[in-house]
C-alpha cells in the first residue's frame, strides 16, 4: 500500500525518496511519474535524472535536495487539487530485476479560507521510514513521531530551508531510502 503525504492547495508538496550512491558521483537514473509505478520506467514522467544530471523536468516539479548525494525527493510547487494522486519514484538500479520502486500517495487539502497568522497546520501527516532490502518483499514501514509545529509564515519557506536545516537530516532518514552496493 502507498505511503500517504499531505499538503494544502497553494503550498509546496514534498515527496521523499532517497538512495545511497555506491560511490560519490556514481549516480543511478531516477524517474518520477504521476500514477503508480508500472513494469518499467515511470508513466506520465514529470522529472528524470540520469547518471550525471536532471535531464528532463516539467514546470512546478523539482528536486530541492542534493540529488548527487541520493536525495531525489520531489517538490511540487503551488499544488492544486488536481495534483492529488499516486506518484512513482523509481530508482533504476542496474541489473536483473534490481530497480526499486516506491508509490507515494499525495493528498491535497483545500486551503483554509482565512488562516490566522498563529494557526498551526501539518506540513505532512507523517514521514514514514521505508526500509527496503535487495529482495522484493513488502517494505517495512514505521512512522516517526510528530514533527515540531510549523506556522504559516515558516511553512512558506520550509522547502528552501530543508536543504540546510537539521530537519533536512531528519527527513533524509525518514523517506523512501535504499542503499546501493
Amino acid at each position: 500500500s502507498e505511503v500517504e503525504y499531505r499538503a494544502e492547495v497553494g503550498q509546496n508538496a514534498y515527496l521523499p525518496c532517497f538512495y545511497t550512491p555506491a560511490a560519490p558521483g556514481n549516480l543511478v537514473p531516477v524517474c518520477w511519474g504521476k500514477g503508480a509505478c508500472p513494469v518499467f520506467e515511470c508513466g506520465n514522467v514529470v522529472l528524470r535524472t540520469d547518471e550525471r544530471d536532471v535531464n528532463y523536468w516539467t514546470s512546478r516539479y523539482w528536486l530541492n535536495g542534493d540529488f548527487r548525494k541520493g536525495d531525489v525527493s520531489l517538490t511540487i510547487e503551488n499544488v492544486t487539487l488536481a495534483d492529488s494522486g499516486i506518484y512513482c519514484c523509481r530508482i533504476q538500479i542496474p541489473g536483473i530485476m534490481n530497480d526499486e520502486k516506491f508509490n507515494l500517495k499525495l493528498v491535497i487539502k483545500p486551503a483554509k479560507v482565512t488562516p490566522a497568522p498563529t494557526r498551526q497546520r501539518d506540513f505532512t501527516a507523517a514521514f514514514p521510514r521505508m526500509l527496503t532490502t535487495r529482495g522484493h518483499g513488502p517494505a517495512e514501514t514505521q512512522t516517526l513521531g510528530s514533527l515540531p509545529d510549523i506556522n504559516l509564515t515558516q511553512i512558506s519557506t520550509l522547502a528552501n530551508e530543508l536543504r540546510d536545516s537539521r530537519l533536512a537530516n531528519d527527513l533524509r532518514d525518514s523517506g523512501a531510502t535504499i542503499r546501493i552496493g
Epitope: G35, A36, P38, V39, F40, E41, C42, G43, N44, V45, R48, Y56, T58, Q92, I93, P94, G95, I96, M97, N98, D99
Partner: antibody
Framework: QVQLVGSGGGLVKPGGSLRLSCAAS????????MSWIRQAPGKGLEWVSF????????YYADSVKGRFTISRDNAKNSLDLQMNSLRAEDTAVYYC????????????????WGQGTTVTVSS | EIVLTQSPGTLSLSPGERATLSCRAS???????LAWYQQKPGQAPRLLIY???SRATGIPDRFSGSGSGTDFTLTISRLEPEDFAVYYC?????????FGQGTRLEIK
C-alpha cells in the same frame, strides 16, 4: 523506415542452445526499451524478457529465468536472446518488439514488431 | 501476476456490424498501462490502442478503447473485412507483463 528483423531460429534438441538476433533500423535504437515475446503454435502471446535502452535494466518471465539471457549492442543496433537448456515447451515463434515511448512520457505498448523467428525444440 | 481474461473467446459478426471485445483483469490495472493488439494469421501483432483509449499511429478511428480498473473494452464501430483477426489485451502495470488469451473475431 522503422523496422525490426529477427533471425537465428531453427531446430534444436532438448537441453540445447540457440541465439536469436533482432536487427533494428530507422530509429534511435538506444532510446528504446526492447522486448522478446513468444507464441507457441496455436496459442496466445507470452512476454519473455525486456531490456532498457542502455542495457542496464533487465527483466525476465519466470518461465525462462536462469536459462535465457537478453542483451543488446547499441553500436550495432542489435538485440539478442541467448537461449540455453531449451525445453519442448520453448517451441514457439519469437518476436522482438520495441516498447513505445515519447519524450518525457512513456506510453506503454509495443509499437514495432519483428516478423518473428521460429524455434523448434524436439528430439 | 495479473491475469487478463478476454471474452468472448470467439465472436462471429458480419461486416458493417459493431464488435465489442472485453478484457477483465484479476486486479486493478492503471488505464495508462493497458494496450490492445490485432494479429492476423502468419503475421506479427499490431498495436491498436495504448493507455486503454489512445489510438496508435495509423489506426483507423473505427477502433476505440475504454475502461478502467479491472474492466476494459475494445470497440470496432463498423467492421471492415480486414478487421477479422485475433485481438489481445496486454498490461504493463506490474511484472510480469501479461497478455489476455485472445478473442477471435470471425466472419459470420
Amino acid at each position: 523506415q522503422v523496422q525490426l528483423v529477427g533471425s537465428g531460429g531453427g531446430l534444436v534438441k532438448p537441453g540445447g542452445s540457440l541465439r536469436l538476433s533482432c536487427a533494428a533500423s530507422g530509429f534511435t535504437f538506444s532510446d528504446y526499451y526492447m522486448s522478446w515475446i513468444r507464441q507457441a503454435p496455436g496459442k496466445g502471446l507470452e512476454w519473455v524478457s525486456f531490456i532498457s535502452g542502455s542495457g542496464s535494466i533487465i527483466y525476465y518471465a519466470d518461465s525462462v529465468k536462469g536459462r535465457f539471457t537478453i542483451s543488446r549492442d547499441n553500436a550495432k543496433n542489435s538485440l539478442d536472446l541467448q537461449m540455453n537448456s531449451l525445453r519442448a515447451e520453448d517451441t514457439a515463434v519469437y518476436y522482438c518488439a520495441r516498447d513505445g515511448m515519447v519524450r518525457g512520457m512513456n506510453f506503454y505498448g509495443m509499437d514495432v514488431w519483428g516478423q518473428g523467428t521460429t524455434v523448434t525444440v524436439s528430439s | 501476476e495479473i491475469v487478463l481474461t478476454q471474452s468472448p473467446g470467439t465472436l462471429s459478426l458480419s461486416p458493417g456490424e459493431r464488435a465489442t471485445l472485453s478484457c477483465r483483469a484479476s486486479q486493478s490495472v492503471s488505464s495508462s498501462y493497458l494496450a490492445w493488439y490485432q494479429q492476423k494469421p502468419g503475421q506479427a501483432p499490431r498495436l491498436l490502442i495504448y493507455g486503454a483509449s489512445s489510438r496508435a499511429t495509423g489506426i483507423p478511428d473505427r477502433f476505440s478503447g475504454s475502461g478502467s480498473g479491472t474492466d476494459f473494452t475494445l470497440t470496432i464501430s463498423r467492421l471492415e473485412p480486414e478487421d477479422f483477426a485475433v485481438y489481445y489485451c496486454q498490461q504493463y502495470g506490474s511484472s510480469p507483463i501479461t497478455f489476455g488469451q485472445g478473442t477471435r473475431l470471425e466472419i459470420k
